[in-house]
């Protein structure tokens, strides 16, 4: 006996009460694949969730988080509080990054500033709570006598005017 249900397309369900006729999914439900014997209830985006995509007969609703929160988990199953740049989220809420660390996003943890000296470079721009340090040329590149495209200007003693 051929299973007539396999002919039922997405957006319908196989109604056993009606001789395996394909019936459309009732309001607020969907079936994303063919051959379904039931339709799934649409997800409701409420509370801290807002609707990113409405539910249709063939696909579930997609939720996003309201302003001040960001999605966590598969399919935005949770909303986590945003912090400001320069902060990280702890058990006691948003806390400023400790000295020597930064966070340039509204989520995630504070990360240590780049250690320029590990790459043999010097600090060009100091780090802040919101920004990493910017590494520049190595100290050796900046010392007098180092080869460069333009020769360094002659050194003068402070307080002496050029001859």
């Amino acid at each position: 006996l051929q299973d007539l249900c396999s002919n039922c397309p997405a957006g319908t369900f196989c109604d056993n009460n009606r001789s395996q006729i394909c019936s459309p999914c009732p309001p607020n439900s969907f079936s994303s694949a063919g051959g379904q014997r039931t339709c799934d209830i649409c997800r409701q985006c409420k509370g801290v969730f807002k609707t990113r995509k409405e539910c249709s007969s063939t696909s579930n609703a997609e939720c996003d988080c309201i302003s001040g929160y960001h999605c966590l988990g598969a399919e935005c199953s949770m909303c986590e509080q945003d912090c400001k740049q320069g902060q990280e989220l702890t058990k006691k809420g948003c806390k400023d990054c400790c000295f020597g660390t930064f966070n340039d996003q509204k989520r995630g943890i504070c990360r240590p500033w780049t250690n320029c000296s590990l790459d043999g470079k010097s600090v060009l721009v100091n780090g802040t709570k919101e920004r990493d340090v910017v590494c520049g040329p190595s100290p050796a590149d900046l010392s007098p006598g180092a080869s460069s495209a333009t020769p360094p200007a002659p050194a003068r003693e402070p307080g002496h005017s050029p001859q």
């Epitope: 801290v48 969730f49 986590e80 509080q81 809420g93 948003c94």
Partner: nanobody
Framework: QVQLVESGGGLVQAGGALRLSCAAS????????IGWFRQAPGKEREGVLC????????IYADSVKGRFTISRDNAKNTVYLQMNSLKPEDTAVYYC??????????????WGQGTQVTVSS
């Protein structure tokens, strides 16, 4: 069954004060955080304040700093939102919600039905 019920809303003049209550039934608030959210007409819902199970307070909305405070009375299974120096822009439906922790909300969290606060100028 599990329920959160808000009360204490009403009409108040700008500069006035209100104290909202969020009473829990069907479960104990001892191990739950309680957050207050609000939704003004035509606007997205926004977080206001939250108090953790240990009493730590998180302020979500900078605009309420120094004006709104949150407290809990575990013996009465109730959390309070004290709103002072009210402004017309505080007009909204205020909801309480019981997440596990103040920083993270899921679709399983219990929400109240809301209480209307209207601030007239």
């Amino acid at each position: 069954q599990v329920q959160l019920v808000e009360s204490g809303g009403g009409l108040v003049q700008a500069g006035g004060a209100l104290r909202l209550s969020c009473a829990a039934s069907g479960f104990t608030l001892d191990y739950s955080a309680i957050g207050w959210f609000r939704q003004a007409p035509g606007k997205e819902r926004e977080g206001v304040l939250c108090i953790s199970s240990s009493g730590d307070v998180t302020i979500y909305a900078d605009s309420v700093k120094g004006r709104f405070t949150i407290s809990r009375d575990n013996a009465k299974n109730t959390v309070y939102l004290q709103m002072n120096s009210l402004k017309p822009e505080d007009t909204a439906v205020y909801y309480c919600v019981a997440p596990r922790i103040c920083s993270t909300y899921s679709s399983d969290d219990y929400w109240g039905q809301g209480t209307q606060v209207t601030v007239s100028s």
